[in-house]
């Protein structure tokens, strides 16, 4: 028989999305056991029928990768999990409506920090996503978010930071003291979607000035 409360078997059914990799996750409820099995279905908002996700039927793990199935940036999606206990009890729970554009979080960028004598150069590498363009290429975050820009900060000392920002991929902080250590932080920002990545950090030391030796 079905439990009084589905939460007894199944809790916290939600999408966890980072850089457009969309993973459905859930927790077992207080009456869930290690041999409880889970089956996953998904559908596009506006569609009537649910589609069973191959590879996520009668599984015991508590996650399912729906990146491919939810890969259209302009669509909204739902997913649902059905839990069946060893004793035959079942419960089904559905996610909130999911939009990858709205809900995905941004990982720190991939950056190369290069030391020079009186400057530090930072080269941001475009972040690939799992989403494929019509030509088969993987889209980068820059392809998806028009308003994406990079915010760079260089901690010079306890009280002074230098800032740079923009949509370029190459930046350089000038006027630095040779043979000195600096802490750089670089974040991805998308203001129109209120997104800000965790920072990439690099600790770099300017090169010694050999011209006086």
């Amino acid at each position: 028989h079905a439990p009084e409360d589905p939460s007894d078997l199944l809790q916290h059914v939600k999408f966890q999305s980072s850089n457009f990799e969309n993973i459905l996750t859930w927790d077992s409820g207080p009456e869930g056991t290690p041999d409880t099995v889970y089956s996953i279905e998904y559908k596009t908002y506006g569609e009537r029928d649910w589609v069973a996700k191959k590879g996520c039927q009668r599984i015991t793990r508590k996650s399912c990768n729906l990146t491919v199935e939810t890969g259209n940036l302009t669509e909204l999606y739902y997913a649902r999990v059905t839990a069946v206990s060893a004793g035959g009890r079942s419960a089904t729970k559905m996610t909130d409506r999911f939009s990858s554009l709205q809900h995905t979080t941004l990982k720190p960028p991939d950056v190369t920090c290069i030391s020079k004598v009186r400057s530090i150069q930072m080269i941001v590498h475009p972040t690939p996503t799992p989403i494929r363009a019509g030509d088969g290429h993987r889209l980068t975050l820059e392809d998806i978010f028009h308003d994406l820009f990079y915010h760079l900060e260089l901690q010079v000392n306890r009280t002074y930071q230098m800032h740079l920002g923009g949509k370029q991929r190459e930046y350089e902080f000038f006027g630095l003291t040779p043979d000195t250590e600096f802490l750089g932080t670089i974040m991805i920002c998308v203001p129109t979607w209120a997104k800000e990545s965790a920072p990439y950090m690099c600790r770099v030391k300017t090169l010694p000035d050999r011209t006086w030796t």
Epitope: G134, H137, L139, H146, D147, G165, K167, P191
Partner: antibody, heavy 117, light 107 residues
Framework: EVQLVESGGGLVQPGGSLRLSCAAS????????MYWVRQAPGKGLEFVSV????????HYVESVKGRFTISTDNAKNTLFLQMNSLKSEDTAVYYC??????????WGQGTQVTVSS | DIQMTQSPSSMSASLGDSVTISCQAS??????LFWYQQNAGQPPKLLIY???RLQTGVPSRFSGSGSGTTFTLTISGVETGDLATYYC?????????FGQGTKVELK
């Protein structure tokens, strides 16, 4: 050398349609943000629409939504602007522009669109 | 939409004068600001990006400053070729918006 060459402008009656083209060369067209920007006679500049040539993502200024459609033919390195239900206030020089290395630094010479009866 | 308010709308300058044009954003745009120069019948030409960084090939008499909501373009020692209309552009969020323009004429 980056080159952008617009065409397709002309005189059209209110309510009519026009399709602008922008032939691009000298850069990786199939992985860029491309823009249409207009300038009404004696007035300032206004961004009309943008498209990412790889993802196909588009944005429009509010005043043209539902009337204008931006698109590309990546095989021919060409940007388009389909303009329907034209109004007199759409009269302007239309420029195409592109963002390269983060900067909107390359513009075409423009094509004149006149909406008048 | 972010509004960009430019002032003055026009100004007269003698050759060699120093000229300052202001641009105010309706919200914080950090340093996401371009300055362009436009001559009649020509497309805009990029002078400054990132509020203060000089575009390659642009003479050093042009300089930009500011961040947040207040920005300035300065021409130190106006030359004949600088008589044109100047626009600021916010590159922070779509729709990208220009200031109304400042026409610099000869006194």
């Amino acid at each position: 050398e980056v080159q952008l060459v617009e065409s397709g402008g002309g005189l059209v009656q209110p309510g009519g349609s026009l399709r602008l083209s922008c032939a691009a060369s000298g850069f990786t067209f199939s992985s860029s943000w491309m823009y249409w920007v207009r300038q009404a006679p004696g007035k300032g500049l206004e961004f009309v629409s943008v498209i990412n040539t790889r993802s196909g993502i588009t944005h429009y200024v509010e005043s043209v939504k539902g009337r204008f459609t931006i698109s590309t033919d990546n095989a021919k390195n060409t940007l388009f602007l389909q303009m329907n239900s034209l109004k007199s206030e759409d009269t302007a020089v239309y420029y195409c522009a592109t963002r390269i290395q983060g900067l909107i630094d390359y513009w075409g010479q423009g094509t004149q669109v006149t909406v008048s009866s | 939409d972010i509004q960009m308010t430019q002032s003055p709308s026009s100004m007269s300058a003698s050759l060699g004068d120093s000229v300052t044009i202001s641009c105010q954003a309706s919200e914080n745009i950090g340093t996401q600001l371009f300055w362009y120069q436009q001559n009649a019948g020509q497309p805009p030409k990029l002078l400054i990006y990132g509020a203060s960084r000089l575009q390659t090939g642009v003479p050093s008499r042009f300089s930009g400053s500011g961040s947040g909501t207040t920005f300035t373009l300065t021409i130190s020692g106006v030359e004949t070729g600088d008589l044109a209309t100047y626009y600021c552009l916010q590159d922070y969020s779509w729709p990208l918006t220009f200031g109304q323009g400042t026409k610099v004429e000869l006194k």
